[in-house]
């Protein structure tokens, strides 16, 4: 069954996934996709990156944590009631049948009505529209646009509560860190 | 446009632990993907890469200085730091700091201009 | 780890000559190989990506080639401002690593 994570409307979507690289520069393939995992690959892919790079994402799919060192989990920015669902994280181990897949459920909750929006946590804002890429090369030799701009200290708190959380640990003890090499 | 500017002492004592800082400009530091990078160049010689930090903290180093290097991160100053412990004279060198991004990992787009360190007593 | 090793160390030249330096791996790094372009007191500036494809502002007199383990960097018709020194760097295994440099020189 799959593990399940909620969301508000409006505010950014974590959904982990971690792997244990054998080196920074020796990774292995990670397809991100909505829907359940299928036989092969990924279907609807909204990430993915090779042996080396992030070569495709979209405006509103990013990775969050360091990929070099396995950290692969996918951001959804400003999430609205059509992003509920199940999300494939794909570990593309080398060798027939090797893959690692993590189906993960996306739950979205409507926005609270509060007096006045929370800093900390909405941080929507701080995000122009992050470009297309399938491996154009280094970000500022591209034409396709801006990458976000993102604040750093309120990301910085948002991981550090993630990784503390009950449900990344739950999601590492659901099997979900694997050790490559 | 994004600017890299190294900054620290020009000289260090052997044995003692070198100190220096990069400060960014034109707006990429506060951007998801970018890894912030050093790199360093002894004189007459090739380049070394030696590590990097990314925005959420995390940090790699090369093997051959692991244990001597720490690259830290001060996010409000838009700064990021090299610490360098139990220097020799191997360890004189110009020392760049320099980007990348995930879309092209150890592709080295900007750079500092590059400070002098020199060890001696 | 990775040696990269270039050649000529030095590279005599005049303006509006072609000008070929060499770069070779000590095992196949693919297409993944950056040239950069240094000048005395400047930092490192890159030229050419994976092998092939020009960084943003580079002119089109700039061109890479080769796959596996021998690369080649042209230039095709010397201007003044070309003479440098150019350094090769892999990026297929990590860590990545960088040649010792041709120095391209005034003859």
């Known amino acids: 069954s799959e593990v399940e994570y909620r969301a508000e409307v409006g505010q950014n979507a974590y959904l982990p996934c971690f792997y244990t690289p054998a080196a920074p520069g020796n990774l292995v393939p990670v397809c991100w996709g909505k829907g359940a995992c299928p036989v092969f690959e990924c279907g609807n892919v909204v990430l993915r990156t090779d042996e080396r790079d992030v070569n495709y994402w979209t405006s509103r799919y990013w990775l969050n944590g360091d990929f070099r060192k396995g950290d692969v989990s996918l951001i959804i920015k400003n999430v609205t009631l059509d992003d509920h669902g199940i999300y494939c994280c794909r570990i593309q181990i080398p060798g027939i049948m090797n893959d690692e897949k993590f189906n993960l459920k996306l739950v979205i909750k409507p926005a609270k009505v509060t007096p006045a929006p929370t800093r900390q946590r909405d941080f929507t804002a701080a995000f122009p529209r992050m470009l297309t890429t399938r491996g154009h090369g280094p970000a500022e030799t591209q034409t396709l646009g801006s990458l976000p701009d993102i604040n750093l200290t309120q990301i910085s708190t948002l991981a550090n509560e993630l990784r503390d959380s009950r449900l990344a640990n739950d999601l590492r003890d659901s099997g979900a860190t694997i050790r490559i090499g | 446009q994004v600017q890299l500017q190294e900054s620290g002492p020009g000289l260090v004592k052997p044995s003692e632990t070198l100190s220096l800082t990069c400060t960014v400009s034109?707006?990429?530091?506060?951007?998801?993907?970018?890894?912030w990078n050093w790199i360093r160049q002894p004189p007459g010689k090739g380049l070394e890469w030696i590590g990097y930090?990314?925005?959420?903290?995390?940090?790699n180093y090369n093997p051959s200085l692991k244990s001597r290097v720490t690259i830290s991160l001060d996010t409000s100053k838009n700064q990021f730091s090299l610490k360098l412990s139990s220097v020799t004279a191997a360890d004189t060198a110009v020392y760049y700091c320099a980007r990348d991004h995930y879309s092209s990992s150890w592709t080295f787009d900007y750079w500092g201009q590059g400070t002098l360190v020199t060890v001696s007593s | 780890e990775i040696v990269l090793t270039q050649s000529p160390a030095t590279l005599s030249l005049s303006p509006g000559e072609r000008a070929t330096l060499s770069c070779r791996a000590s095992?196949?790094?693919?297409?993944?190989l950056a040239w950069y372009q240094q000048k005395p007191g400047q930092a490192p500036r890159l030229l050419i990506y994976?092998?092939?494809n020009r960084a943003t502002g580079i002119p089109a007199r700039f061109s890479g080639s080769g796959s596996g383990t021998d690369f080649t960097l042209t230039i095709s018709s010397l201007e003044p401002e070309d003479f440098a020194v150019y350094y090769c760097q892999q990026r297929s295994n990590w860590p990545p690593t960088f040649g010792q440099g041709t120095k391209l020189e005034i003859k």
């Open positions: 095992q196949s790094v693919s297409s993944y």
């Open positions: 930090i990314y925005y959420s903290g995390s940090t």
């Open positions: 034109g707006g990429s530091f506060s951007r998801g993907g970018y890894y």
């Open positions: 994976d092998a092939s």
